[in-house]
C-alpha cells in the first residue's frame, strides 16, 4: 500500500513540475527590465526565451520574436536546448509512468516490468527536473553577471548615430517557476525510485544456489584406507558424494538469510 | 542598423506653422518610445515631445497645446506638427527612436537634426 501510494504520489508531483516547466519555457517574463521611467509615461520591456515584449503602464502591451537563431546569444540557445531536452524526458517519462502505476493493470504484465518501468519513468523525471534547474540556473547566472550588458557603444553612419543603453535586467517570475518546477519533478523522480525499491518481487528470477554442509557423503570405513568416495565403483548403487551442492528445487530448505545471494 | 531621415524643417515666420517627419529603416524588435529633443544654440538638449509605441504622448510644458506627436505605424514615420511658432521654438531638431535591437540589446537611434528658424 506504502509503495503504491509512493509511487502515485511521485507520478503527480512529477506531472505537476512537468506542467511547470513547460509553463516556465512558454513563459515570457525570464527577464524584465526598468527601461524608460518618467512622471507621464513608463515603458518596461521584458523578454523570454523565445520573443521579448514591451508594456505600457496604460497595460497595452506588444510582443515580438528574435528575428534569427544566428543573432541570439549561445548561452541563450542553451538554455532553450536544456528546458525543451527537459520537457521531452518529463513527457517520456510520464508516459512510461503511467503504465508502471501499480493500480493500473495491463495485460499480464509482471512486477518485475512494472518496477524497471518504475525506476526508468524515475530517472527520466531526475534527469529533466536537472536539465530545467540547469536552464534556468544558466540564465539567471547570465543576469547575475550582465552577461550582455554593453557599455554605452556608438555607432555613427549617414542618418545620424545610433547608441546602445546599458540596462539592467532583473529575475522575471519564469525563472521562479523554473526552478520550483524543476525541484518538484526531480522529487516526483526520487519517489519513483523509491517505489521501485518496493514494487521489486519477494522471490528472485534466477536459481538461487544453496550450499551446505555434506559429511554424510564421504563413508570412512576402519581397517586400512579403504573408503568409498564415491570416484570408485559403487557397489551398492546408491548415491555417496553429491558434491553438497543442492538447488532449492532439489532439496526443501528453510529460508534462511544467508541463502540468497 | 537602424537609420532616421528627418524632413519638415526650414524658416518660418511668428505664429506660422510646420511639420516636421522622422522615417526609420532597419531592423527593430521592439519600438520603445520615438520622439524629438531640441536644441537652440548655447544651450543644452531639451525634450520636446515623446510617442510611445501604445501611442502614449507626453510633451514639455512650454510647447503644450502648440505641438502634436502623432506616428504612422505604416510607414514607420513619427510626425511633429508644431503650430503658433515664437522665436524660442528656434533650434535644431533631434528626432530619436528608442528601441530593443535584439536579446537584452536596447539602443537609441539619433538622426543628424533639422534646422527650425521662427523670425520675422
Known amino acids: 500500500m506504502a509503495v503504491t501510494a509512493c509511487q502515485g504520489l511521485g507520478f503527480v508531483v512529477s506531472l505537476i513540475g512537468i506542467a511547470g516547466i513547460i509553463a516556465a519555457t512558454c513563459m515570457d517574463q525570464w527577464s524584465t527590465q526598468d527601461l524608460y521611467n518618467n512622471p507621464v509615461t513608463a515603458v518596461f520591456n521584458y523578454q523570454g526565451l523565445w520573443r521579448s515584449c514591451v508594456r505600457e503602464s496604460s497595460g497595452f502591451t506588444e510582443c515580438r520574436g528574435y528575428f534569427t537563431l544566428l543573432g541570439l546569444p549561445a548561452m541563450l540557445q542553451a538554455v532553450r536546448a536544456l528546458m525543451i531536452v527537459g520537457i521531452v524526458l518529463g513527457a517520456i517519462g510520464l508516459l512510461v509512468s503511467i503504465f508502471a502505476l501499480k493500480c493500473i493493470r495491463i495485460g499480464s504484465m509482471e512486477d518485475s516490468a512494472k518496477a524497471n518501468m518504475t525506476l526508468t519513468s524515475g530517472i527520466m523525471f531526475i534527469v529533466s527536473g536537472l536539465c530545467a534547474i540547469a536552464g534556468v540556473s544558466v540564465f539567471a547566472n547570465m543576469l547575475v553577471t550582465n552577461f550582455w550588458m554593453s557599455t554605452a557603444n556608438m555607432y555613427t553612419g549617414m542618418g545620424g548615430m545610433v547608441q546602445t543603453v546599458q540596462t539592467r535586467y532583473t529575475f522575471g517570475a519564469a525563472l521562479f517557476v523554473g526552478w520550483v518546477a524543476g525541484g518538484l519533478t526531480l522529487i516526483g523522480g526520487v519517489m519513483m525510485c523509491i517505489a521501485c525499491r518496493g514494487l521489486a518481487p519477494e522471490e528472485t528470477n534466477y536459481k538461487a544456489v544453496s550450499y551446505h554442509a555434506s559429511g554424510h557423503s564421504v563413508a570412512y570405513k576402519p581397517g586400512g584406507f579403504k573408503a568409498s568416495t564415491g570416484f570408485g565403483s559403487n557397489t551398492k548403487n546408491k548415491k555417496i558424494y553429491d558434491g553438497g551442492a543442492r538447488t532449492e528445487d532439489e532439496v526443501q530448505s528453510y529460508p534462511s538469510k544467508h541463502d540468497y545471494v | 542598423q537602424v537609420q532616421l531621415v528627418e524632413s519638415g524643417g526650414g524658416l518660418v515666420q511668428p505664429g506660422g506653422s510646420l511639420r516636421l517627419s522622422c522615417a526609420a529603416s532597419?531592423?527593430?524588435?521592439?519600438?520603445?518610445?520615438t520622439g524629438w529633443y531640441r536644441q537652440a544654440p548655447g544651450k543644452q538638449r531639451d525634450l520636446v515631445a515623446t510617442i510611445t509605441f501604445g501611442g502614449t504622448t507626453n510633451y514639455a510644458d512650454a510647447v503644450k497645446g502648440r505641438f502634436t506627436i502623432s506616428r504612422d505605424n505604416a510607414k514607420n514615420t513619427v510626425y511633429l506638427q508644431m503650430n503658433n511658432l515664437e522665436p524660442e521654438d528656434t533650434a535644431v531638431y533631434f528626432c530619436?527612436?528608442?528601441?530593443?535591437f535584439g536579446f537584452g540589446d536596447r539602443r537609441v537611434a539619433w538622426d543628424q537634426g533639422t534646422q527650425v528658424t521662427v523670425s520675422s
Open positions: 530619436y527612436l528608442d528601441y530593443i
Open positions: 532597419g531592423s527593430i524588435l521592439n519600438l520603445m518610445t
